[in-house]
């Protein structure tokens, strides 16, 4: 029987700016029952403060809602582990909120082949931002990402969308059923996970661009 | 603890490049950016740029088009190429990792240095 | 580039002095996130540098309460309240808000 090992906040994870969650590996638990806290302070700050929520983010995780959120302040935060047999404490981790927002996937994409009389077909592509996410507020830039491919291809096209929700190709294989995907990232942050699949028939007579 | 140990040639022809390693323990490079740094001798510090926890990199504009920076995550060793090197390249050369989690400037770990001299 | 220039470029002082820094940037190095990225650091003869101060005026784990940070803008003062032996070396201020980063040229505090 031992005190117990070590633990490491591995990650931390916000939606908006707005909450995040934080979670970390156990370190060997000694043989003996173990628990776990998190504490933290805020820049400029002596103060320790327990995690406000050990729910929301599954095991081993410390949740902090919109009241313990603050985008402009950097948190200093420490997971303790203790047994029978004494303690071990984490590194400390500085999170900075700005720096660790990977939002949900894009909403609604819709995908139609347009076949204007006068000019070249296309394929529009069209998305909405996540609803987590106010753009409004003029605090969050949001870059996307398209990928497709014929559905028996094993390569990617990407395109980079910059801020729009809406996109045209041009370059189109006739006849071929293709896979489409958006993902979006914050101008600091992570990109999303891709949006679910949507499928789109090219029609035989699409032509293809130059 | 967090440590960063730096490896690389310490004398440079003129017209050559420069490779230096620097090796980290105590964290990942999945979770924090590490950046080039170097010093003249006797002269002040030059930030050359980073290579970010998801492998996006940042560079100084003066020095861009010779500089490059990689990392193997699965190593934990992040790597400095410099090419076409002239005598007032000669620094000490360090690598110092990011002090927030997933972030970028702020360099809370340095390694120790490794001194290029560039003569032929 | 933002040009981070540091006065004074030598400063001599004696031991209990308090000391006082200048760091000004070319333009105002606010981040896009409203965050301000400008550091402290004292590099030691023959050391590493080593992190004093993050954004602004937040002590790094382990420094001292005699060092502390202010200012907003392009206008940063680092301020030593009680200098001891071991805070002699040059300091250099830092910006990482804008790419790409700068330094500042450096001040020495050194005995009088």
């Known amino acids: 029987q031992l005190p117990p090992g070590k633990p490491e906040i591995f990650k931390c994870r916000s939606p908006n700016k707005e909450t995040f969650t934080c979670w970390w590996r156990p370190g060997t638990d000694g043989g003996l029952p173990t628990n776990y806290s998190l504490t933290y302070h805020r820049e400029g700050e002596t103060l320790m403060h327990e995690c406000p929520d050990y729910i929301t983010g599954g095991p081993n995780s410390c949740h902090f809602g919109k009241q313990y959120t603050s985008m402009w302040r950097t948190y200093i935060m420490m997971v303790n582990a203790t047994n029978q047999m004494g303690s071990s404490f984490s590194d400390e981790l500085y999170v900075d909120v700005t720096y660790i927002v990977q939002p949900d996937p894009p909403l609604e994409l819709a995908v139609e082949v347009k076949q204007p009389e006068d000019r070249k077909p296309y394929l529009w592509i069209k998305w909405s931002p996540p609803t987590l996410i106010d753009l409004k507020t003029g605090w969050f830039t949001l870059l996307y990402e398209i990928r497709l491919k014929p559905e028996k291809a094993a390569e990617w096209e990407i395109h980079f969308a910059g801020q729009q929700t809406e996109f045209k190709i041009l370059s189109l294989h006739p006849g071929q059923k293709y896979l489409v995907q958006v993902r979006c990232k914050p101008d600091h942050g992570y990109w999303s996970a891709w949006s679910p699949a949507t499928f789109i028939q090219i029609p035989s007579d699409f032509t293809m661009n130059d | 603890q967090v440590q960063l140990q730096q490896s690389g040639p310490g004398l440079v022809a003129p017209s050559q490049s420069l490779s230096i390693t620097c090796t980290v323990s105590?964290?990942?490079?999945?979770?924090?950016?590490v950046n080039w740094v170097r010093q003249p001798p006797g002269k002040g510090l030059e930030w050359l740029g980073i290579?970010?926890?998801?492998?996006?990199?940042n560079y100084n504009s003066a020095l861009m088009s010779r500089l490059s920076i990689s990392k193997d995550n699965s190593k934990s060793q992040v790597f400095l190429k410099m090419n076409s090197l002239q005598t007032d390249d000669t620094a000490m050369y360090y690598c110092?990792?990011?002090?927030?989690?997933?972030?970028?400037?702020?360099?809370?770990?340095w390694g120790q240095g490794t001194l290029v001299t560039v003569s032929a | 580039d933002i040009v981070m220039t540091q006065t004074p470029l030598s400063l001599p002082v004696s031991l209990g002095d308090q000391a006082s820094i200048s760091c000004r940037s070319s333009?105002?190095?606010?981040?896009?996130?409203?965050?301000?990225?400008l550091e402290w650091y004292l590099q030691k003869p023959g050391q590493s540098p080593k992190l004093l101060i993050y954004?602004?005026?937040n002590r790094f784990s382990g420094v001292p309460d005699r060092f502390s940070g202010s200012g907003s803008g392009t206008d940063f003062t680092l301020k030593i309240s009680r200098v001891e032996a071991e805070d002699l070396g040059v300091y250099y201020c830092?910006?990482?808000?804008?790419?790409?980063?700068?330094f500042g040229g450096g001040t020495k505090l050194e005995l009088k």
């Open positions: 830092f910006q990482g808000s804008h790419v790409p980063w700068t």
């Open positions: 110092a990792r990011s002090l927030y989690y997933y972030g970028s400037s702020s360099f809370a770990y």
């Open positions: 290579i970010g926890a998801g492998g996006s990199t």
């Open positions: 105590g964290f990942s490079l999945t979770s924090y950016g």
């Open positions: 954004k602004v005026s």
């Open positions: 333009q105002s190095i606010v981040h896009s996130n409203g965050n301000t990225y």
